[in-house]
């Protein structure tokens, strides 16, 4: 079973030793009592470590209290606080205790002093140029409107990348998407239809006003 010294019942830095019946605390200078809980030290003895501020205990019978500076704890400010043990960094951020301050190193997709801001969250995300935000799998993506691309739809898409204009047609990015300037002898939105020598095209019915070689929108 658990021993009487388990959990260290001795306060104020006292050391515990087991006895046949129970336990015994060996108290540091200035403390006494079964568990070293009674202080015989006053502020005049300077009991507060690490820059702690001592309050009370002007006469020998009165106790004192140490007000500890940030980063320290214990009745005499003798223990350094592991502020990272409180897990202040959210969303899997790495906690760094720098002594004077705490810093969180955030995982990709998160930001803020405590990694509290989810950059991949549609709620705080705007997709430019009429794009819509789509969440999924803990991340987001922008579904961009025609003619735009990139993470936030801020980049003009390259509609000519796939060389959509056939038979030597020249492709131009256009506000409406793309436009093909067809080489002579071809017509259609992508210059896909040959124009027959007699002027008729291979189209089932040529759109009105269409001329051979006309760039098509």
């Amino acid at each position: 079973g658990p021993g009487p010294c388990d959990g260290n019942p001795c306060a104020n830095g006292g050391s515990c030793s087991e006895t046949p019946r129970s336990f015994e605390c060996t108290c540091p200078r200035g403390f006494y009592g079964l568990r070293c809980e009674v202080s015989g030290v006053t502020c005049a003895d300077g009991p507060c470590f690490n820059g702690g501020l001592c309050v009370g205990g002007a006469d020998p019978d009165s106790a004192y209290i140490c007000h500890c500076p940030p980063g320290f704890q214990g009745s005499n400010c003798e223990k350094r606080v592991d502020r990272c043990s409180l897990q202040p960094c959210r969303n899997g951020g790495l906690c760094l205790d720098l002594g004077h301050a705490l810093r969180c190193r955030c995982r990709a997709g998160f930001a803020g002093p405590r990694c509290e801001h989810d950059l991949d969250d549609c709620a705080g995300r705007a997709c430019a140029n009429g794009g819509t935000c789509v969440e999924g799998g803990g991340a987001h993506r922008c579904s961009c409107a025609l003619g735009f691309g990139g993470r936030d739809c801020r980049e003009r898409a390259d509609p000519c990348a796939a060389r959509p204009c056939a038979h030597g047609g020249r492709c131009y990015a256009h506000f409406s998407g793309l436009v093909c300037a067809c080489a002579p002898g071809y017509m259609g939105a992508r210059c896909e239809f040959p124009v027959h020598p007699d002027g008729a095209s291979a189209l089932p019915a040529a759109p009105p006003g269409l001329r051979p070689g006309d760039p098509q929108r």
Epitope: E155, R156, D158, P159, C160, A161, A162, R163, G168, R170, C171, Y172, A173, H174, V179, A181, A183, P184, R211, G213, D214, P215
Partner: antibody, heavy 123, light 111 residues
Framework: QEQLVESGGGLVQPEGSLTLTCTAS?????????MCWVRQAPGKGLEWIAC????????TDYANWAKGRFSISKTSSTTVTLQMTSLTVADTATYFC???????????????WGPGTLVTVSS | QVLTQTPSPVSAAVGGTVTISCQAS????????LAWYQQKPGQPPKLLIY???SLASGVPSRFKGSGAGTQFTLTISDLECDDAATYYC????????????FGGGTEVVVK
């Protein structure tokens, strides 16, 4: 405001090589049709050299006389280069970068020009 | 393909009219793919007219382009001192590839 600036001009020996750079600001090539080079010998007229698609296809067009010695390429979304080899005294000229846009079913409309960079070929 | 411009130079008084001709050795693309440019000394050219007759942005209506196929004309009316420059026509063609050609230029002198 949309701008083009050429750089890389200077004095070069006959049979030497030179690379000119055209840098755009205020727009990116991918949304602007084609980027082209045009040159002008001192006191002479304009002479078209080559064009390259502003998009990722990299399609190019060259004047017949420029094929082989001149090479146009796009090095980023805002820079285009013209590599010139085996230069002769006849290549002495101001070299302009120009943007070719599609307007009303017509092409090779150079609606934006850089100030030009002077290339002098001399021994 | 050759574009021949005439005459050069051409001169006229302030308020007058000049006409510049551009003759192509063969029809330009779509019969209308011809542009006109204005160039002043030490400056790059400036697009004036595209599609043979359409006015480029910011160009005054005193500049007028006309023609089709192989014969084109640039007319400048109500001449101003600022119109003194060299004017170039530019045609676009397709023959197993796209290419463009400039005319030799016409100098306009305003008296």
């Amino acid at each position: 405001q949309e701008q083009l600036v050429e750089s890389g001009g200077g004095l070069v020996q006959p049979e030497g090589s030179l690379t000119l750079t055209c840098t755009a600001s205020g727009f990116s090539f991918s949304s602007s049709g084609y980027m082209c080079w045009v040159r002008q010998a001192p006191g002479k007229g304009l002479e078209w050299i080559a064009c390259i698609s502003g998009g990722s296809s990299g399609d190019t067009d060259y004047a017949n006389w420029a094929k082989g010695r001149f090479s146009i390429s796009k090095t980023s979304s805002t820079t285009v280069t013209l590599q010139m080899t085996s230069l002769t005294v006849a290549d002495t000229a101001t070299y302009f970068c120009a943007r070719d846009v599609y307007i009303d079913s017509t092409i090779f409309n150079f609606n934006l020009w850089g100030p030009g960079t002077l290339v002098t070929v001399s021994s | 393909q050759v574009l021949t411009q005439t005459p050069s130079p051409v001169s006229a008084a302030v308020g007058g009219t000049v006409t510049i001709s551009c003759q192509a050795s063969q029809s330009v693309y779509n019969n209308n793919n011809l542009a006109w440019y204005q160039q002043k000394p030490g400056q790059p050219p400036k697009l004036l007219i595209y599609a043979a007759s359409s006015l480029a942005s910011g160009v005054p209506s005193r500049f007028k382009g006309s023609g089709a196929g192989t014969q084109f004309t640039l007319t400048i009316s109500d001449l101003e001192c600022d119109d003194a420059a060299t004017y170039y026509c530019q045609g676009t063609y397709y023959s197993s590839g796209w290419y463009s050609t400039f005319g030799g230029g016409t100098e306009v002198v305003v008296k």
